[in-house]
Interface confidence: low
């Protein structure tokens, strides 16, 4: 599929001008290559009319130009003094005409309306309001006032001053007669439809002395604004319909076959399942304008979108609308990353978030999408040292691995953590990505004690048991704070006895705190990583209390002489597992999709990439009791 994008249809009137914008991926090659506008012939060729290399066909001499905007990835073709001969099929493209790096554009130039003398032209947008003014003379002041519409050869009564209203206009038309001082009556038509367009005749009086006035009503369907965004990226539709519909329900819909427009989201609480977790309808302003943000763009999101206002929250005849044509560029600069990450309850997940690598110094954020009302995304953590209070001790945003990716680790998972999360930065707004966290059944991997109490001035040793599947991973202990997790020295105590069917490759790694102080109180994590790519973590809260008796504390999972198959793992410890990144292959960004054959083995990763049919529940706030 060609990554070039432009308007599918351009309509204009004889004598007018058009401006046609074509979009291309702004790679360095594309920025400097030839741009062209050509007309398609009956036998398939395409004859160049104008190009960026200075060529202008004699047909376009003195009335057309082509301007490249390499920084935006666009070029614009302006054509003036249009005639009906200009109607036809064209291509805008890059390189050579036959190469296929192009987009088809249909240009239709119509004749200007043939108007009667003394005809007032009203040009109004679809869904809006028109006021047709009709002057009359004093002798007709007391006589019947009427408005007719010319249908074919015959005038059809639309409204009159005796109370008649044509059924096609019921509920959206009125006839106002001005005060005695002004010899004028007005007909106001609301919620204009395309079918309202045409020639009208105002009349005051019914005899040969009646006053008549011709009006031509042109109802404009909005030209779609072209929007060109990257696959996996984000788009924002800004919808400003005007203060007259400030209190009417708003919607964004996507046109499917024919005239159907399927609601994507509306202010009445409807949201299409395909957009769950990746859409926000930003609150309306007083003037009725609003915006809709969609993240995690997919190929199938491409198409024509309309925003509008109607009490039903969906497109109806006469809704005022705004239109966009969204093109999703598959030659995306946004790297693939898992769209679904699975973790076991009590476990952890490590989420990789892409960002624009040119903006390494930007602030990174992670927020939780909430579907209530029209969607919102309250922040949970940032790279500047802020963590939402309810997430203290179990959430960390790390700048690693860097170079276009940051990591978010969330541990102590519960079913309430299932839901959609957004990765954001304060830089390029197109790089908003979405990940769904799913909580699944399973056995935990890392084993740590429950919350631990240390004694002031004494030594505390906290164990972390790593199964053999992590034998090739780096094992670490760190102390959590709101800027990350600071690494601490730890001791490998040899094989662990905490696992059944696990050989000498299992490991018991201890954290030792000597001469405990009040400053040692807090959350500690043990975890695994490979280089700058993080895997599973487990968290322990260490409380510090006054000395009661001399000696050191050695916290173990259970009594040391327990047989491997004994059920000693009770409420005094926590088992934590992360199914998100366990297979070392997953640490390579480009290999985010584990082979499905790996899924049968519990030791393998469970990461989905691409769109997911399943939807997770929404998350709530989480509270710790320290």
């Amino acid at each position: 599929k060609s990554p070039i994008f432009g308007p599918e249809e351009v309509n204009s009137v004889e004598g007018n001008s058009v401006s046609i914008t074509c979009y291309y991926p702004p790679t360095s090659v594309n920025r400097h290559t030839r741009k062209y506008w050509c007309r398609q012939g009956a036998r398939g060729g395409c004859i160049t009319l104008i190009s960026s290399e200075g060529y202008v066909s004699s047909k376009y001499a003195g009335r057309a130009n082509l301007t490249n905007f390499p920084e935006n990835g666009t070029f614009v073709v302006n054509i003036a003094q249009l005639s009906q001969d200009d109607s036809g099929r064209y291509k805008c493209g890059l390189g050579i005409n036959s190469r296929g790096l192009s987009f088809d554009v249909s240009l239709e130039v119509s004749q200007g309306p043939g108007l009667l003398n003394d005809t007032k032209v009203y040009t109004v947008d679809l869904g809006r309001t028109v006021t047709i003014n009709c002057p009359f003379k004093t002798e007709n002041a007391q006589k019947r006032k009427s408005l007719y519409k010319q249908i074919g050869l015959y005038p059809v009564l639309v409204i009159d001053s005796s109370g008649y209203v044509n059924p096609n206009y019921t509920g959206r038309i009125r006839l106002d007669i001005q005060g005695t001082g002004q010899l004028l009556f007005s007909v106001v038509i609301n919620q204009l439809r395309l079918s309202d367009a045409g020639q009208y005749l105002c009349q005051a009086g019914d005899d040969s002395n009646s006053n008549k006035k011709n009006a031509d009503l042109q109802v404009l369907k909005p030209e779609p604004e072209l929007v060109y965004e990257d696959l996996r990226g984000s788009v924002t539709f800004h919808c400003a319909l005007g203060p007259e519909v400030a209190n009417v329900a708003k919607f964004l819909c996507r046109q499917s076959s024919g005239e159907n427009c399927d609601v994507v989201v509306n202010t009445l609480g409807k949201r299409a399942p395909a957009f769950e977790g990746r859409i926000l309808l930003n609150p309306q302003d007083k003037d009725g304008s609003f915006s809709v943000v969609i993240t995690g763009l997919r190929k199938e999101d491409a198409g024509r979108y309309l925003c509008g206002a109607h009490s039903d929250g969906q497109l109806q005849e006469g809704s005022p609308i705004q239109a966009w044509q969204l093109f999703v560029n598959e030659e995306s600069t946004i790297p693939r990353s898992p769209t679904v990450v699975k973790g076991v309850a009590g476990s952890s997940v490590a989420v990789l978030c892409p960002y624009n690598r040119k903006e390494s110094k930007s602030i990174k954020y992670w927020c939780l999408w909430e579907g209530a009302q029209n969607g919102r995304c309250p922040l949970l953590v940032d790279s500047e040292g802020w963590v939402k209070a309810q997430y203290e001790g179990r959430l960390s945003l790390l700048e690693e691995p860097g170079n276009g990716t940051f990591t978010v680790i969330l541990n102590q998972l519960t079913s309430r953590d299932a839901g959609f999360y957004w990765c954001l930065t304060n830089g390029d707004t197109l790089w908003r990505t979405t990940v769904e966290i799913k909580i699944i059944e399973g056995e935990p991997n890392l084993k740590v004690p429950g919350n631990v109490t240390a004694v002031l001035g004494e030594t505390l040793k906290v164990p972390c048991h790593f199964p053999c599947k992590f034998s090739s991973y780096e094992k670490y202990w760190c102390k959590w704070n709101n800027t990350g997790c600071q690494a601490l020295p730890s001791q490998d105590e040899g094989p662990s006895k905490a696992f059944v069917n696990c050989d000498e490759n299992s490991r018991l790694v201890s954290l030792t705190l000597n001469l405990v102080t009040r400053a040692d109180e807090g959350w500690y994590w043990c975890g695994v990583k490979q280089g700058h790519f993080y895997g599973e973590t487990a968290a322990v809260y260490v409380a510090v209390e006054e000395r009661k008796a001399a000696g050191s504390r050695d916290v173990s999972l259970a009594k040391a002489d327990a047989a491997p198959d004994e059920k000693v793992l009770d409420s005094g410890f926590r088992e934590i597992e992360n199914k998100a990144i366990q297979d070392p292959r997953l640490f390579a960004e480009e290999k985010a999709v584990a082979d499905t054959r790996d899924q049968a083995d519990g030791s393998r990763a469970s990461v989905d990439s691409g769109s997911s049919e399943e939807q997770g529940g929404s998350s709530r706030h989480h509270h710790h009791h320290h």
């Epitope: 930003n282 995304c377 922040l379």
Partner: nanobody
Framework: QVQLVESGGGLVQAGGSLRLSCAAS??????????MAWFRQAPGKEREFVAS????????YYADSMKGRFTISRDNAKNTVNLRMNSLKPDDTAVYYC????????????????WGQGTQVTVSS
């Protein structure tokens, strides 16, 4: 670069109301991507947080002493953020500053990227 300009300050009697407005402008401003906040600084005191509203208007936060009296709102179409102040007290006398943070606001912690010049509010008893 984002420029913030406050307006609406002035002299008001205790118990009265004022509405402050902050207009944001900038060459590449995507106003709906900024969290917005109001801070104030009384003579001889440190600048303190007043209220904030998040990037998509989903949440508002207020300093405890201003809850119920002050209301923050935003109009993304006009690139403005407003602060409605009711039941004003002499203690509310200060220079009020508008602040912006890309994507940001959460509780009373607000790491502003941009600041306005401030507008003086004086509450007389």
């Amino acid at each position: 670069q984002v420029q913030l300009v406050e307006s609406g300050g002035g002299l008001v009697q205790a118990g009265g109301s004022l509405r402050l407005s902050c207009a944001a402008s900038g060459r590449s401003l995507g106003f709906d991507t900024y969290g917005m906040a109001w801070f104030r600084q009384a003579p001889g005191k440190e600048r303190e947080f007043v209220a904030s509203i998040d990037w998509n208007g989903g949440s508002t936060y207020y300093a405890d002493s201003m809850k119920g009296r002050f209301t923050i709102s935003r109009d993304n179409a006009k690139n403005t953020v407003n602060l409605r102040m009711n039941s004003l007290k002499p203690d509310d006398t200060a220079v009020y500053y508008c602040a912006a943070a890309r994507y940001y606001t959460s509780s009373t912690y607000f790491p502003a990227n941009y600041w306005g010049q401030g507008t003086q509010v004086t509450v007389s008893s």
